[in-house]
Interface confidence: medium
């Protein structure tokens, strides 16, 4: 299953809208900065697009449960987040259309729940966070910049296990 | 592996500018802060300002504010220093310098650093 | 800004002497210390972040502690390749300002 043309510009358009949702500016939130420890190696050792597309799946589903939440609602802009939860629908979409055709059944099932099981941990973390910081707007503002990176890595890896196919 | 690779060595009269070059490789460009900071002969490290090419913000320290640019191209990987209105005391070796490693966040640790560029200002 | 001192500005010591170098931020930094070496003619490498993480491939014999103000490099059996210059630097808030260095020289 190749993802169509049109999932990586969405790729885009999501970073693009994540870039406009911002209200104030990361330097003057420095001192709220969080690692999160993104598990960038569940998308680097993936060593095929099927073992990848469940766990960037998992991904954007946890990117769009982070933002669909009330909490967040009054945090963002309403028009930029009904066009970010548009665009991960859409990928979504497509990502689970390859599920669909079997592209997300391999020999490891496994190392593959082990992947998606991190992310979820990482999201724990985030919104444990979240929670911690009470919702302030330097809170989300970290959290903002750390899933434009996340998800910036995330599509970069996936990106260049397709050049290797 | 990760590196950062910088331009040559400059010589440059006083009042004039000079552009540093600084090639990302290895790493997700775009995603991790790049940093410049300058070493004048003999002396200390002195932080001069820095970007997340993602966010499309650069942040410079405020002995520096309107002398200095920072600009990213993300096409070519590569980070820019511009510095303008230069005296005899920029004469130092600037490096750029980036937080990649896996417990690094930004800004939090400098553990990439280019060689360095050799900037002499003289008359 | 922030201002960061260290001391001693320089240090006298012999291989397999235990060192500590410290560093005084002017306000509070929580935990965003880092620690660099530097050697003549070459970049400096980062030893410790975070006041107290080791740097990926960086020898045990380094470690790092403090909080708020107060913070210490501690290099626990000299080598003959630990003679260098030492910097601590806040990556609390910009500008992120370096101590003036330690120069650890031979006895």
């Known amino acids: 299953c190749d993802l169509p043309q049109t999932h990586s510009l969405g790729s885009r358009r999501t970073l693009m809208l994540l870039a406009q949702m911002r209200r104030i500016s990361l330097f003057s939130c420095l001192k709220d900065r969080h690692d999160f420890g993104f598990p960038q190696e569940e998308f680097g050792n993936q060593f095929q697009k099927a073992e990848t597309i469940p766990v960037l799946h998992e991904m954007i589903q946890q990117i769009f449960n982070l933002f669909s939440t009330k909490d967040s609602s009054a945090a963002w802009d309403e028009t930029l987040l009904d066009k970010f939860y548009t665009e991960l629908y859409q990928q979504l979409n497509d990502l689970e259309a390859c599920v669909i055709q079997g592209v997300g059944v391999t020999e490891t099932p496994l190392m593959k729940e082990d992947s998606i099981l991190a992310v979820r941990k990482y999201f724990q973390r985030i919104t444990l966070y979240l929670k911690e910081k009470k919702y302030s707007p330097c809170a989300w503002e970290v959290v903002r910049a750390e899933i434009m990176r996340s998800f910036s890595l995330s599509t970069n890896l996936q990106e260049s296990l397709r050049s290797k196919e | 592996q990760v590196q950062l690779v910088q331009s040559g060595a400059e010589v440059k009269k006083p009042g004039s500018s000079v552009k540093v070059s600084c090639k990302a490789s290895?790493?997700?460009?775009?995603?991790?802060?790049i940093n410049w900071v300058r070493q004048a002969p003999g002396q200390g490290l002195e932080w001069l300002g820095g970007?997340?090419?993602?966010?499309?913000?650069?942040h410079y320290a405020q002995k520096f504010q309107g002398r200095v640019t920072i600009t990213a191209d993300e096409s070519t990987s590569t980070a820019y220093m511009e510095l303008s209105s230069l005296r005899s005391e920029d004469t130092a070796v600037y490096y750029c310098v980036s937080s990649v490693g896996a417990g690094a966040y930004y800004y939090q640790g400098l553990d990439v650093w280019g060689q360095g560029t050799l900037v002499t200002v003289s008359s | 800004d922030i201002q960061m001192t260290q001391s001693p500005s320089s240090l006298s010591a012999s291989v397999g002497d235990r060192v500590t170098i410290t560093c005084r931020a002017s306000?509070?930094?929580?935990?965003?210390l880092n620690w660099y070496q530097q050697k003549p003619g070459k970049a400096p490498k980062l030893l410790i972040y975070?006041?107290?993480s080791l740097q990926s491939g960086v020898p045990s014999r380094f470690s790092g502690s403090g909080s708020g103000t107060d913070f210490t490099l501690t290099i626990s059996s000299l080598l003959p390749e630990d003679f260098a210059t030492y910097y601590c630097?806040?990556?609390?808030?910009?500008?992120?300002?370096f101590g003036q260095g330690t120069k650890l020289e031979i006895k």
């Open positions: 970007t997340v090419p993602l966010f499309g913000i650069s």
């Open positions: 975070a006041a107290s």
């Open positions: 630097q806040q990556s609390y808030l910009p500008p992120y300002s």
């Open positions: 306000q509070s930094i929580s935990s965003y």
């Open positions: 290895g790493y997700t460009f775009t995603s991790y802060d």
